[in-house]
Interface confidence: medium
């Protein structure tokens, strides 16, 4: 369905508010260092231009592609070369190479200051003074720090952000009302960003076949009553939506996401009984609700899979004649029967099934060869089950902070070349799996845990790709998307690693430690723990525990002292000396 003017088409479909929000997000994700005012100016210019095209689709330049229009606009930024260096060279290219160039320069770890939350009264004043600017600033600040954030979902977060201020700035106790809501939005936002980053990595590094396989498995778990053809249609549409968003085509992505939500709500009967409450909501909320909807109940009378996929004499015929359809149907049938399995496990099983058919359908007696294929699945199923069981037991025994520390030690020993801030960030997030998943009933633990770990390990892969330092990390990240987690789990102590020389400066602390929040204190201690392991990779758990206990005691003592700085200056070197002796 072609339009004379793409920009007019999207403006009319999305409406001015969403159009402006999405263009701001797109520009902020591309030019992450540009000041807010510059982006607002560019967005206003694009919006005015779009309005002229709505009035007359034949007007000059209205027939240009969105990439051409947006790219031309970004390339008018005066300080492009000074601020972005070689990214400015993108502007010498023609579309579609120019957009690809901009995409390649998106920075997953931009050098931006952490967002500081002002006093509640200050925020409420800013909100009341200029609500529109306040909300635009939110979109800008989140988008530039999370260049792959799912744009239509960010509009939903902004709507919730607005609602929180509208409600709480009227409340008697503004802070008690607002702060928990902002904490929730921040945490949910980080999680949403990380989940979307995995989808984009899946599409960009492993292709749309990998993404479609993921989507077949996940949607079959969610919608076990839907027929395969219905799931396939949803997968095709969902792949288009995410391909567009990951490719920077945010207007098309948001428009297609709205169409998908409309389709799902019009076809609830053939998809899931759980969609009803989502479909009564307004657009942004509806799309979010549909994405997060709980699994429908499994049909009661599902027959055994063995009949069609093991016992049938037509297995090789069906596989040969339509490989991807046959494997897709296998994945659909397996996933709808197993909401208790992680998506990654289901994909491993499909991969194992494919490998067996490749081998057996070429053999003299195919049927005899693949007759035991389901037995081969057992070790693949037991591995994540055991992993979840062991780690949940460890989490329950240690609590979150000490569980994170155990993971910090484990991962630093596996890949000590990785930077300390990355190891701390990734291990802290890996450790959050405990609180998130271990409290769930058995049937929900594995999908929660393993699919969450895949998201966190993708963050490690993305950061490592920017500055590669470890062949082991590169291997685990690039060889197989579905086997990333087992690959990292299987890594042992890196025997080839040359321990880092001891640097007393790394273990020198000051009185400012005492004013830090609990979380910031933990990060400081965990940073020291990683550095200790890098210095002594073969240190035992007991040795490390002893040093960390001494560290906590030393910090506590000095933070209670009258002259805190003098205490740190005096006790610090003693702590360092004692630690070196303990680890010798």
């Amino acid at each position: 369905d072609t339009h004379k003017s793409e920009v007019a088409h999207r403006f009319k479909d999305l409406g001015e508010e969403h159009f402006k929000g999405l263009v701001l997000v797109a520009f902020s994700q591309y030019l992450q260092q540009c000041p807010f005012e510059e982006h607002v100016k560019l967005v206003n210019e694009v919006t005015e231009f779009a309005k002229t095209c709505v009035a007359d689709e034949s007007a000059e330049n209205c027939d240009k592609s969105l990439h051409t229009l947006f790219g031309d606009k970004l390339c008018t930024v005066a300080t492009l070369r000074e601020t972005y260096g070689e990214m400015a060279d993108c502007c010498a290219k023609q579309e579609p190479e120019r957009n690809e160039c901009f995409l390649q320069h998106k920075d997953d770890n931009p050098n931006l200051p952490p967002l500081v939350r002002p006093e509640v009264d200050v925020m409420c004043t800013a909100f009341h003074d200029n609500e529109a600017t306040f909300l635009k600033k939110y979109l800008y600040e989140v988008a530039r720090r999370h260049p792959y954030f799912y744009a239509p979902e960010l509009l939903f977060f902004a709507a919730r952000y607005k609602a929180a201020f509208a409600e709480c700035c009227q409340a008697a106790d503004k802070a008690a009302c607002l702060l928990p809501k902002l904490d929730e939005l921040r945490d949910e936002g980080k999680a949403s960003s990380a989940k979307q980053r995995l989808k984009c990595a899946s599409l960009q590094k492993f292709g749309d076949r990998a993404f479609k396989a993921w989507a077949v498995a996940r949607l079959s778990q969610k919608f076990p009553k839907a027929e395969f053809a219905e799931v396939s249609k949803l997968v095709t549409d969902l792949t288009k939506v995410h391909t567009e968003c990951c490719h920077g085509d945010l207007l098309e992505c948001a428009d297609d996401r709205a169409d998908l939500a409309k389709y799902m709500c019009e076809n609830q009967d053939s998809i899931s009984s759980k969609l009803k409450e989502c479909c009564d909501k307004p657009l942004l909320e509806k799309s979010h609700c549909l994405a997060e909807v709980e699994n429908d109940e499994m049909p009661a009378d599902l027959p055994s899979l063995a009949a069609d996929y093991v016992e049938s004499k037509d297995v090789c015929k069906n596989y040969a004649e339509a490989k991807d359809v046959f494997l897709g149907m296998f994945l659909y049938e397996y996933a709808r029967r197993h909401p208790d399995y992680s998506v990654m496990l289901l994909l491993r099983l499909a991969k194992a099934y494919e490998a067996t058919l490749e081998k057996c359908c070429a053999a003299a007696d195919p049927h005899e060869c693949y007759a035991k294929v389901f037995d081969e699945f057992q070790p693949l199923v037991e591995e994540p089950q055991n992993l979840v069981k062991q780690n949940c037991e460890l989490f329950e025994q240690l609590g979150e902070y000490k569980f994170q520390n155990a993971l910090l030690v484990r991962y630093t020993k596996k890949v000590p070349q990785v930077s300390t801030p990355t190891l701390v960030e990734v291990s802290r997030n890996l450790g959050k799996v405990g609180a998130k998943c271990c409290k769930l009933p058995e049937a929900k633990r594995m999908p929660c845990a393993e699919d969450y770990l895949s998201v966190v390990l993708n963050r490690l892969c993305v950061l490592h790709e920017k500055t590669p330092v470890s062949e082991k990390v590169t291997k685990c990240c690039t060889e197989s998307l579905v086997n990333r987690r087992p690959c990292f789990s299987a890594l042992e102590l890196d025997e080839a690693y040359v321990p880092k020389a001891f640097n007393a400066e790394t273990f020198t602390f000051h009185a400012d430690m005492c004013t830090l929040s609990e979380k910031e204190k933990q990060v400081k201690k965990q940073t020291a723990l990683v550095e200790l392991v890098k210095h002594k990779p073969k240190a035992t758990k007991e040795q490390l525990k002893g040093v960390m206990d001494n560290f906590a005691a030393f910090v506590e003592k000095c933070c209670k002292a009258d002259d805190k700085e003098a205490c740190f200056a005096e006790e610090g070197p003693k702590f360092v000396a004692a630690s070196q002796a303990a680890l010798a």
């Epitope: 596989y319 040969a320 058919l357 490749e358 359908c361 070429a362 053999a363 195919p366």
Partner: nanobody, 116 residues
Framework: EVQLLESGGGLVQPGGSLRLSCAAS????????MGWVRQAPGKGLEWVST????????YYADSVKGRFTISRDNSKDTLYLQMNSLRAEDTAVYYC?????????WGQGTLVTVSS
């Protein structure tokens, strides 16, 4: 080193026949399923047919069923594709490939043109 060398392509009229051959070397031919894949001008790859290692089982795409026959001679390490009742839409480069459906090696291809 695995080598697959196709031959037998050429220009043929609609309704005519051709027989493609593929000489294989560098691997144990009779341990491997083999297949044919084609690519029409400006189109993507399309699977045509597969034969099991011992030649007992053969598989065809719907578009060629009843017209094409895949066979092999394990003593000569050679794969064949007999193409009858050829149509204009069969015009393509035909590749011989090693594997069942997840082909790991391909030949250079032989061009088949069906035109009056």
């Amino acid at each position: 080193e695995v080598q697959l060398l196709e031959s037998g392509g050429g220009l043929v009229q609609p309704g005519g026949s051709l027989r493609l051959s593929c000489a294989a070397s560098g691997f144990t031919f009779d341990n491997n399923a083999m297949g044919w894949v084609r690519q029409a001008p400006g189109k993507g790859l399309e699977w045509v047919s597969t034969i099991s290692a011992n030649g007992n089982a053969t598989y065809y795409a719907d578009s060629v069923k009843g017209r094409f026959t895949i066979s092999r001679d394990n003593s000569k390490d050679t794969l064949y594709l007999q193409m009858n009742s050829l149509r204009a839409e069969d015009t393509a480069v035909y590749y011989c490939a090693k594997g069942f459906r997840r082909f790991d090696y391909w030949g250079q291809g032989t061009l088949v043109t069906v035109s009056s």
